[in-house]
Interface confidence: medium
């Protein structure tokens, strides 16, 4: 097993707001990661960079710096939030997300995350990609793993 394991657990919550005039959707998506240090020494989680894609278009980016340190044979669960905007050429989604006649307005988003860990100045980067369902029609809190979208495109663990 690699010395640092990063596991994308899933979407924890998605908070939605709209701009009616611009036909724009704002989604604040909080994700959960498990980072396991299989080494016999501590490592620093220097930064987490994340982006969210919808229909192959990047709709949001985030970066967290100087996050935490993880002791030997230890694991930390880290939440990070990516603010996303669905607008302009994707404003057609506004109608779907605000449609009252349907209860759940799930869209499929691709979550990409890169974790940079350091030890004595040496950096290691680990990336993950996951497809997730997110409801763009209401504020939602998910049980971990509940939002997972399984299809043939999804890279295996």
């Amino acid at each position: 097993p690699r010395s640092i394991d990063v596991k994308y657990i899933g979407v924890k919550s998605a908070y939605v707001s709209y701009d009616v005039q611009k036909r724009t959707i704002y989604l604040n998506i909080t994700n959960t990661l498990n980072i396991t240090n299989n080494n016999y020494y501590s490592v620093e989680v220097e930064n987490i960079t994340a982006q969210v894609q919808f229909a192959k278009t990047v709709i949001g980016k985030a970066r967290l710096n100087n996050i935490t340190h993880i002791g030997p044979l230890d694991m930390k669960q880290i939440d990070y939030t990516v603010p996303t905007v669905i607008a302009e050429e994707m404003s057609y989604m506004y109608d779907f997300c605000t449609l009252i006649s349907i209860k759940v307005h799930n869209i499929v988003l691709m979550m990409q995350v890169t974790v940079t860990t350091t030890y004595f100045g040496h950096s290691e980067q680990i990336s993950q990609e996951r497809y997730q369902y997110v409801d763009c029609g209401r504020n939602t809190t998910y049980q971990l793993g509940q939002s997972e979208y399984l299809n043939v495109l999804q890279p295996q663990q």
Epitope: Y40, Y41, S42, G71, D74, F120, H122
Partner: antibody
Amino acid sequence: QVQLQQSGAELIRPGTSVKVSCKASGYAFTNYLIEWVKKRPGQGLEWIGVINPGSGITNYNEKFKGKATLTADKSSSTAYMQLSSLTSEDSAVYFCARSDFITTVVADYWGQGTTVTVSS
Amino acid sequence: DIVVTQTPLSLPVSFGDQVSISCRSSQSLTNYYGNTYLSWYLHKPGQSPQLLIYGISNRFSGVPDRFSGSGSGTDFTLKISTIKPEDLGMYYCLQGTHQPRTFGGGTKLEIK
């Protein structure tokens, strides 16, 4: 002062299992790793595996995967090693020891050892 | 797994002697970051092993200064400057750099 108190000697039938305990005192249990080591008569020390009691994450010597299972109970500051499907080859003295997170001093304090005898 | 070879297997001594025990690993014990986790232990019959030296050359608390460690990379040495009766027993080196940790086969320090 730092102490690791192990459970008493065990006489076990072949094919059964045994759980050896290692109770820590005199230090912060979750700030140190717990190592397990095997010593058979006439043979050298053999490293079995290590557990971080805070996270429960383990790392095993390949030879002992499936044989030894390491666990820890934070509330009682006790580490455990379960040995399964016992044979005469498992008759040995088993030691626990602690290792420092920060300085990576490996196995600085040891338990007194638990003798496991497998016999029908 | 890392193979750790200790020599000699047996070391007959007289009290007052100076002796050296060698420990050689199948690959470097210095990790990417320049740290080397090599320890020495003394194990006497009926007792628990006791840590003598860690990190190649650091004496553990309470260990007499007649014990010293040296080496780098793959070759390490434990020196005992003046053998005393309480020094008799089995000596082991342990590499803690790589997973899994591995002990050397041991060196028996016994009276001639």
